[in-house]
């Protein structure tokens, strides 16, 4: 059973991560960002079901994508270069959901521009995080 | 009803520049952009580039780099594009068109460029 | 420099479904946008984001996109579908917009 640091670790985690997504949706979703119209033309897949931390499984698969639509936007949208931000969300990520058990990520048929995909899991953190407290 | 009305055709001699303006109505100017594409006679359609219509910001096609420029007036909700040292290969019917992201909601009604002015033919000619 | 490729022309009767094809590299990470373009006239955008519809559309046109190759789909095609269409996207780092070259939908 968890333990309430194990919760609290989980949860500042949770909250580092919902940082870093809403970081990024503001930096896209910008007057400033004169590359948006571009930015809109990726597609990145999306979880049919999130409801759990291994299921961050889907999100760690899409990092790559989310990285090389980053590299577009101008670095003064955001605080850190795209790779060292996708480096730490990384990071999060592979602690939330763990690496001791294998969890194949199924996708939703439709794809999903960088604005859904993000408001898609910052909502999933949102989630989380609200069943911790 | 969203429009955009742009400017009369224009012919220009080698080496000169032309300036097409497009007019915004119908909805609220500065929270979308407005792409420029254009299409020589008889041949497919070619992007130029983009402007804010909020803040001005630009992103210009690579061939069209130094030699466009797109600006924009708020207070008639018009935008322009200027495109200079103008060569025969330049003639072609000009368009604006809006992009359907709505900046800061953080959604749209549909991306791409969802509504066209009806295009402004530019002769290059000498 | 990036390229989308989409037949020249396509001949359907009335009726019967028209489909245009769009490949590129690019297209199993980028979505395609289909435009439609009568003699003369503004294109009219029928197709964003592989398979949505704008308002305003007739529900015979739908898109669809599997690895690199987009299409867009006429069911029951009629004689004012006859037009230029055009599709659209991104190159794989996104720096570069590019419109096929267009195809001729002919409904005899």
């Known amino acids: 059973a968890p333990t309430s640091s194990s919760t609290k670790k989980t949860q500042l985690q949770l909250e580092h991560l919902l940082l870093d997504l809403q970081m990024i949706l503001n930096g896209i979703n910008n007057y400033k960002n004169p590359k948006l119209t571009r930015m809109l033309t990726f597609k990145f897949y999306m979880p049919k079901k999130a409801t759990e931390l291994k299921h961050l499984q889907c999100l760690e698969e899409e990092l790559k994508p989310l990285e090389e639509v980053l590299n577009l936007a101008q670095s003064k949208n955001f605080h850190l270069r795209p790779r060292d931000l996708i480096s730490n969300i990384n990071v999060i990520v592979l602690e939330l959901k763990g690496s001791e058990t294998t969890f194949m990520c199924e996708y939703a048929d439709e794809t999903a521009t960088i604005v859904e995909f993000l408001n898609r899991w910052i909502t999933f953190c949102q989630s989380i995080i609200s069943t911790l407290t | 009803e969203v429009q955009l009305v742009q400017s009369g055709a224009e012919v220009k001699k080698p080496g000169a520049s032309v300036k097409v303006s497009c007019k915004a109505s119908g909805y609220s100017f500065t929270t979308y952009g407005i792409s420029w594409v254009r299409q020589a006679p008889g041949q497919g359609l070619e992007w130029m580039g983009w402007i804010s219509a909020h803040n001005g910001n630009t992103d210009y096609a690579q061939k069209f780099q130094g030699r466009v420029t797109m600006t924009k007036d708020t207070s008639t909700s018009t935008v322009y594009m200027e495109l200079r040292s103008l060569r025969s290969d330049d003639t072609a019917v000009y368009y604006c068109?809006?992009?359907?992201?709505?900046?800061?909601?953080?959604?749209?009604?549909?991306?791409?460029?969802?509504?066209w002015g009806q295009g402004t033919l530019v002769t290059v000619s000498s | 420099s990036y390229e989308l490729t989409q037949p020249p022309s396509v001949s359907v009767s009335p009726g019967q479904t028209a489909r245009i094809t769009c490949s590129g590299d690019a297209l199993p990470r980028k979505f395609a946008y289909w435009y439609q373009q009568k003699s003369g006239q503004a294109p009219v955008m029928v197709i964003y984001e592989d398979s949505k519809r704008p308002p305003g559309i007739p529900e015979r046109f739908s898109g669809s996109s599997s690895g690199t190759m987009a299409t867009l789909t006429i069911t029951g095609a009629q004689v004012e579908d006859e037009a230029d269409y055009y599709c659209?996207?991104?190159?794989?780092?996104?720096?570069?917009?590019?419109f096929g070259g267009g195809t001729k939908l002919t409904v005899l």
């Open positions: 659209y996207s991104t190159d794989s780092g996104g720096d570069v917009s590019v």
């Open positions: 068109a809006r992009d359907g992201y709505h900046y800061g909601s953080g959604s749209y009604d549909n991306a791409g460029f969802d509504h």
